[in-house]
């Protein structure tokens, strides 16, 4: 599930990783756009082994994965859900 959240919280991520996470290990991805209390975009990944990590938005692999998910969401195939929460 890919989720895009707009929140008024401060930054959630205190450290970020660029280490590649294979898609089969990923359970959920949350994108927190820049602004609303945090000056940077944040990407939070929940892994299937019950761990959670902040991923560097500049990491090439996450950018490629986001692009694939965006393309899927605009097709007619079953797609991950995009949730938008506006305060």
């Amino acid at each position: 599930v890919l989720e895009v959240y707009y929140t008024s919280l401060r930054c959630r991520c205190v450290q970020e990783s660029s280490v590649f996470i294979p898609r089969r290990f990923i359970d959920r991805i949350q994108i927190l756009p820049r602004g609303n209390g945090c000056p940077r975009k944040e990407i939070i990944v929940w892994k299937k082994n019950k761990s959670i990590v902040c991923v560097d938005p500049q990491a090439e692999w996450i950018q490629r994965m986001m692009e694939v998910l965006r393309k899927r969401s605009s097709s007619t195939l079953p797609v991950p859900v995009f949730k938008r929460k506006i305060p």
């Epitope: 959630r12 205190v14 450290q15 959920r28 939070i44 929940w46 082994n49 019950k50 959670i52 902040c54």
Partner: antibody, heavy 122, light 107 residues
């Protein structure tokens, strides 16, 4: 506010099964990311993580005890359970129920119960 | 399993002293470490998360630091209410493992 409370026998004999209950309030085990676990501490010694159970019934155990441990939950009644089979005197400890929530920033075991002291003695 | 070697196991210090406790991880845990404080007869509570970040309500005299595989907790000026046991926890991978603990006593 978040509270957890452990209950179980104060004393039991070697080879018996220890059954512990954690009753919690202030959160539910049904939302994504929520988990409850068990940690023990022999008197005057360090902490040892035993097991975690998550909202989706995923379970994780300490490999050194995996053959003796069973963790379970009753989401609707806000309870979690731990069973330890074939106990011996080295299982004497204070047993803590703990909460973990997979949010950022992630702080595992952010809330603890008061603990229940269990003595194994013949 | 990842081993956490904590030192010292016990120490005595005077009020106002600077105190440092260390945990060494047997493999890379990438800052996935929490320090807990446990006062006598009480349950542990988180002090520091992700190795260097203060938990809510924790006084600024506490700080955490990392140097390669060594993680340290420092109290800059010891107060009487800091007399407690301190535990490190790695949560990089299961099984989560604690250090053996450090008992901090008043000299």
């Amino acid at each position: 506010q978040v509270t957890l409370k452990e209950s179980g026998p104060e004393i039991l004999q070697p080879s018996q099964t220890l059954s512990l209950t954690c009753t919690f309030s202030g959160f539910s085990l049904s939302p994504y990311g929520m988990g409850v676990g068990w940690i023990r501490q022999p008197s005057g010694k360090g902490l040892e993580w035993l097991a975690n159970i998550w909202w989706d019934d995923d379970k994780y155990y300490n490999p050194s005890l995996i053959n003796r441990l069973t963790i379970s939950k009753d989401t609707s009644n806000n309870q979690a359970f731990l069973k330890i089979t074939n106990v011996d005197t080295t299982d004497s400890a204070t047993y803590y129920c703990v909460r973990s929530e997979l949010v950022m920033p992630y702080v595992p075991f952010d809330y603890w119960g008061q603990g229940v002291m269990v003595t194994v003695s013949s | 399993d990842i081993q956490m070697t904590q030192s010292p196991s016990s120490m005595s210090a005077s009020l106002g002293d600077r105190v440092t406790i260390t945990c060494q991880a047997s493999q890379d845990i990438e800052n996935d470490l929490v320090w807990f404080q446990q006062k006598p007869g009480r349950s542990p509570r988180p002090l520091i998360y992700y190795a260097t970040n203060l938990a809510n309500g924790v006084p600024s005299r506490f700080s955490g630091r990392r140097s390669e595989s060594d993680y340290s907790l420092t109290i800059s000026s010891l107060e009487s209410e800091d007399m407690a046991d301190y535990h490190c926890l790695q949560f990089k991978q299961y099984p989560y493992t604690f250090g053996a603990g450090t008992k901090l006593e008043l000299k």
